[in-house]
């Protein structure tokens, strides 16, 4: 059995040249003719040189999985899905995303260091001593309140709560 060159495919004991991306094999090569190729029908594609008798079906971006169509399918490129705003891609296969997760909400005591994108989750960071955050989408931790000379500090601030002052 012969081993075919790269971008050739085996038919019986003959090696045939592959079709270009965007095409599929209509008729395999013979003594006098090379591989006859046909364009991929609508909603199908081949992304690489290939020996396929049929083009591959275009992917569908499922909104129930948090996906939206970012780039329509073409005869030589599969559909590119992206996550809807507020979500990031959990399972990325090349340029294709199959499932999305909601961006993490930073807990109290942390601030948003890096906002989430379509392909990255939110990055949270702890508040430094002397500051606090209620969490959520807050990008800056707020400084604790300094009780005035006429106020008494009832409870010291934490990374998630402000200082409590009394007016007595």
């Amino acid at each position: 059995q012969p081993s075919c060159r790269q971008e050739e495919f085996l038919v019986g004991d003959e090696c045939c040249p592959m079709c270009n991306p965007g095409y599929h094999v209509k008729q395999v090569c013979s003594e006098h003719t090379g591989t006859v190729c046909a364009p991929c029908p609508p909603q199908t594609y081949t992304a690489h040189a290939n020996g396929l008798s049929k083009c591959l079906p275009c992917g569908v971006c499922d909104p129930d999985m948090g996906l939206l169509t970012w780039q329509e399918c073409s005869s030589w490129k599969d559909t590119v899905c992206r996550c809807i705003p507020g979500y990031f891609c959990e399972n990325q296969d090349g340029s294709h995303c199959s499932t999305c997760l909601q961006h993490t909400t930073c807990p109290p005591g942390q601030r948003v260091e890096k906002r989430g994108t379509h392909d990255q989750d939110t990055v949270c960071a702890d508040c430094l001593t002397g500051t606090f955050s209620l969490g959520g989408t807050q990008e800056e931790c707020l400084p604790w309140t300094n009780c005035s000379a006429f106020q008494q500090e009832v409870r010291r601030g934490t990374n998630s709560t402000d200082t409590t002052c009394s007016s007595q």
Partner: antibody
């Protein structure tokens, strides 16, 4: 003797249309795929379009897709190329050529000149 | 899309000399390569198909070789009528049918 004779070329304005014909003789016309190949002045050869023997399968180069249509009338032994929305870059000698399946071209006509200019 | 690159662009030789023309494909086209000769003001003429098969009526001083990506057209002894432009064409995977850019063989 195989003969291919093109006609229909001429001067046309950009955006205009033209229909080329190729009269074939000396072989069983319906048994062969037929092609149009063009050559811009001083340039190389560029395949334009192909049609199967029955006329059921047609292919075109990306550069002419949606503008040029290849067809044939096997009862008249004639190949056609309908050219619409012509551009300056379509200026060339257009040859019709007999194909071995969608392979090489064993016989060529003498060509007809299409000039697209305002 | 497959690209065919012919070299050299121009070959300056004298009658009686041997001419070697090269055609390289960007990916394998098997043995499915043809060579054509074109003289000024004339249509191309098929010389060789299937990389090495001589078209009927073509003198045997013309020969072709190669497969896959590298092909050669050889004219063993140049005759005055052989000075012309030569094109290679792949039909290993078509459409589209692709031609090389041509090699001009001129008198030195």
């Amino acid at each position: 003797e195989v003969q291919l004779l093109e006609s229909g070329g001429g001067l046309v304005q950009p955006g205009g249309s033209l229909r080329l014909s190729c009269a074939a003789s000396g072989f069983t016309f319906s048994s062969y795929s037929m092609n149009w190949v063009r050559q811009a002045p001083g340039k190389g050869l560029e395949w334009v379009s192909a049609i199967s023997g029955s006329g059921g399968g047609t292919y075109s180069a990306d550069s002419v897709k949606g503008r040029f249509t290849i067809s044939r009338d096997n009862s008249k032994n004639t190949l056609y190329l309908q050219m619409n929305s012509l551009r300056a870059e379509d200026t060339a000698v257009y040859y019709c050529a007999r194909g071995k399946a969608y392979g090489y071209f064993d016989y060529w006509g003498q060509g007809t000149l299409v000039t697209v200019s305002s | 899309e497959i690209v065919l690159t012919q070299s050299p662009g121009t070959l300056s030789l004298s009658p009686g000399e041997r001419a070697t023309l090269s055609c390289r494909a960007s990916r394998s086209v098997g043995k499915y390569l043809a060579w054509y000769q074109q003289k000024p003001g004339q249509a191309p003429r098929l010389l060789i198909y299937a990389a090495s098969t001589l078209q009927s009526g073509i003198p045997d001083r013309f020969s072709g070789s190669g497969s896959g990506t590298d092909f050669t057209l050889t004219i063993s002894r140049l005759e005055p009528e052989d000075f012309a432009v030569y094109y290679c064409q792949q039909y290993g995977s078509s459409p589209p049918v692709i031609f090389g850019q041509g090699t001009k063989v001129e008198i030195k």
